[in-house]
Amino acid sequence: LIIGFGISGRHSITVTTVASAGNIGEDGILSCTFEPDIKLSDIVIQWLKEGVLGLVHEFKEGKDELSEQDEMFRGRTAVFADQVIVGNASLRLKNVQLTDAGTYKCYIITSKGKGNANLEYKTGAFSMPEVNVDYNASSETLRCEAPRWFPQPTVVWASQVDQGANFSEVSNTSFELNSENVTMKVVSVLYNVTINNTYSCMIENDIAKATGDIKVTESEIKRRSHLQLLNSKAS
């Protein structure tokens, strides 16, 4: 969480941002809140990006003002116009690109004053893994697949029964470049698995951590997976 204040001159207002991550090719949110004003027409929101000549987005007098928008953001940004009056200046960024990563500034002017806060935005690719029993293999084998990751993640296997065991010798991980030549498909195979055990396939890069669990018993197979974004710090 980053909390910024205005510095001098007119009164300062508190602006709060939260560091976040964007999944390339999908839509992302850059979060920013501020002390609200009673009149929408008195609120100016500007999003700036470090090193960029134009603006990322501007909202003033109750509507978007995009004459100064930088080319790299054209047609890809929107604020939640109906929520500005309650202090939400968050930016929706469509079709997140790898090059959208960087430091952003949420800058607010209201009748009460002005303030700003920076936000670190990471971009990459992350997806939920799915773990299945590989019935084509010669021995009991698990196959963990996740369709889109970037940068290249690490893959670690763990087991509930053999906690702390190192499975690197009995697993094999491969990364296959997807058609857009940026993201990669992750495939990891674990050999010599035992029945009545829960195995976890953990995929992690500096943006996200995802886990796929599988419990194999004689009578059934149970699966569970979850994904967590890393470094979501507020400012």
């Epitope: 001159g9 007119r10 960029v52 000549l53 134009g54």
Partner: antibody, heavy 119, light 107 residues
């Protein structure tokens, strides 16, 4: 220490060309938009050109559009200004300056390099 | 292009005096007004950005105010080292433009 050092200035005839360089050190060069600003002898400041941190966007003053080209090499931490079809009125000290945010001024400047266009 | 009109073009004041310089933009530039100090033979130095924000390391006797088209720069107590030319600059729209400068001298 954050530093910008210009070079490449000198005496050139009208119609001639010159390339100015600005070597940056002490900061992450690619994170900053960079600008060229000039000052004719005894006169005020005139903004000339700008380039985004990635090099993907450029802007020019009308007085130099079509004659000057701004560029950068982030691997060398260097900013350039290629000046063609030079005129007597281009005579000035040329400064490079950095701007982290598009609206918030130029916080670091070089010492300047003098360009004299005369026959 | 946005025209920036600075006044006065020069002034002479005593050490300790309050000095005020004004800058007027030909159209609304919101808060996008910066002030620079330039000493003879030196590069300009950023003092104030965003109309009223003091750049890191700049003495608190310097201040700025205003928004829209009318801006003011103030030195609350003039010091001998403040002898310089001061420029306003708009960064609302390209091309960024400067005022013509105000030369400050000591009486």
């Amino acid at each position: 220490e954050v530093q910008l050092v210009e070079s490449g200035g000198g005496l050139v005839q009208p119609g001639g060309s010159l390339r100015l360089s600005c070597a940056a050190s002490g900061f992450t060069f690619s994170s900053y938009a960079m600008h060229w600003v000039r000052q004719a002898p005894g006169k005020g400041l005139e903004w000339v050109s700008a380039i985004s941190g990635s090099g993907g966007s450029t802007r020019y003053a009308d007085s130099v559009k079509g004659r000057f080209t701004i560029s950068r090499d982030n691997s060398k931490n260097t900013l350039y200004l290629q000046m063609n079809s030079l005129r007597a009125e281009d005579t000035a000290v040329y400064y490079c300056a950095r701007g982290r945010w598009s609206k918030w001024g130029f916080d670091v400047w070089g010492q300047g390099t003098l360009v004299t266009v005369s026959s | 292009d946005i025209q920036m009109t600075q006044s006065p073009s020069s002034l002479s004041a005593s050490v300790g005096d309050r000095v005020t310089i004004t800058c007027q933009a030909s159209q609304d530039i919101s808060n996008y007004l910066n002030w620079y100090q330039q000493k003879p033979g030196k590069a300009p130095k950023l003092l104030i950005y965003d109309a009223s924000n003091l750049e890191t390391g700049v003495p608190s006797r310097f201040s700025g105010s205003g928004s829209g088209t009318d801006f003011t720069f103030t030195i609350s107590s003039l010091q001998p080292e403040d002898i310089a030319t001061y420029y306003c600059q708009q960064t609302d729209n390209f091309p960024y433009t400067f005022g013509q400068g105000t030369k400050v001298e000591i009486k």
